[in-house]
């Protein structure tokens, strides 16, 4: 569950569940910073614009990131 705030981390809970790349509207990867000491991955779904915090350590999520970056490299000229 993401939570808006001015400082510190955004994700309150994280999901190990894989997400279908086709159902993704947006995938945000927020690197660790002075405000939050961990990488955060926030998926925005096409359906209802629902958001989900993903577990960067999950194998399924790592595979998702690979699939998305592969798709992006196909699209780029």
């Amino acid at each position: 569950v993401p939570l808006s705030r001015t400082v510190r981390c955004t994700c309150i809970s994280i999901s190990n569940q894989p997400v279908n790349p086709r159902s993704l509207e947006k995938l945000e990867i927020i690197p660790a910073s002075q405000f939050c000491p961990r990488v955060e991955i926030i998926a925005t779904m096409k359906k209802k614009g629902e958001k989900r915090c993903l577990n960067p350590e999950s194998k399924a999520i790592k595979n998702l990131l690979k699939a998305v970056s592969k798709e992006m490299s196909k699209r780029s000229p």
């Epitope: 705030r5 809970s13 994280i14």
Partner: antibody, heavy 121, light 109 residues
Framework: QVQLVESGGGVVQPGRSLRLSCAAS????????MHWVRQAPGKGLEWVAL????????YYADSVKGRFTISRDNSKNTLYLQMNSLRAEDTAVFYC??????????????WGQGTTVTVSS | EIVLTQSPGTLSLSPGERATLSCRAS???????LAWYQQKPGQAPRLLIY???SRATGIPDRFSGSGSGTDFTLTISRLEPEDFAVYYC??????????FGPGTKVDIK
């Protein structure tokens, strides 16, 4: 099965301290934010505190800020609430609840049975 | 801080009737952040509806949620004996506190 079990409640004098525990089982505790919610006798629900899945984020209701501390031990699958400077108005049933992670906000989907705290001289 | 108001305070109905419960917020709440809970005497609350309109796992389809902005509604299409309880709405806005409404008691007429 998915379960939360609170303990540590009891009768305590005003100004004293108490620590509540919540033992989690049946799910990946270390992935879930956790809440404490209380209910005074005959009253409604009051959100008390929230801690993020890895303990980095902590949030409190104004009524307990500076007196209560939420914490967790993911290696023990346990949530805590340290309550200091207790007042008569803190008398309530205290529930721990899971913040469901599979969506933007799916509410508090698992609750414990509650533990009763009575603050009285 | 967002304040939630629920009406009516008590709703007296008979089994089989339709119940309409209202939850009003003092400022706009994203639909993603509005939940409804049921609580029976001596029991912990149970999540019914999340995201204003999505039923939680195992919740019968006679329960439905709707609304957006500041006005939200929980509807029980046909009251069953086990539905007589107190119902709370809760907002999980962009920052704490994550307030609950004062509750609506649905009792038997």
């Amino acid at each position: 099965q998915v379960q939360l079990v609170e303990s540590g409640g009891g009768v305590v004098q005003p100004g004293r301290s108490l620590r509540l525990s919540c033992a989690a089982s049946g799910f990946t505790f270390s992935n879930c934010g956790m809440h404490w919610v209380r209910q005074a006798p005959g009253k409604g629900l009051e959100w008390v505190a929230l801690i993020g899945y890895d303990g980095i984020n902590e949030y409190y209701a104004d009524s307990v800020k500076g007196r209560f501390t939420i914490s967790r031990d993911n290696s023990k699958n346990t949530l805590y609430l340290q309550m200091n400077s207790l007042r008569a108005e803190d008398t309530a049933v205290f529930y721990c609840a899971r913040d469901w992670p599979e969506g933007y906000y799916n509410g508090m989907d698992v609750w414990g049975q509650g533990t009763t705290v009575t603050v009285s001289s | 801080e967002i304040v939630l108001t629920q009406s009516p305070g008590t709703l007296s109905l008979s089994p089989g009737e339709r119940a309409t419960l209202s939850c009003r917020a003092s400022q706009s709440v994203s639909s993603s952040y509005l939940a409804w809970y049921q609580q029976k005497p001596g029991q912990a609350p149970r999540l019914l509806i999340y995201g204003a309109s999505s039923r939680a796992t195992g919740i019968p389809d006679r329960f439905s949620g709707s609304g957006s902005g500041t006005d939200f509604t929980l509807t029980i299409s046909r009251l069953e004996p086990e539905d007589f309880a107190v119902y709370y709405c809760q907002q999980y806005g962009s920052s704490p506190p994550f307030t609950f409404g004062p509750g609506t008691k649905v009792d038997i007429k």
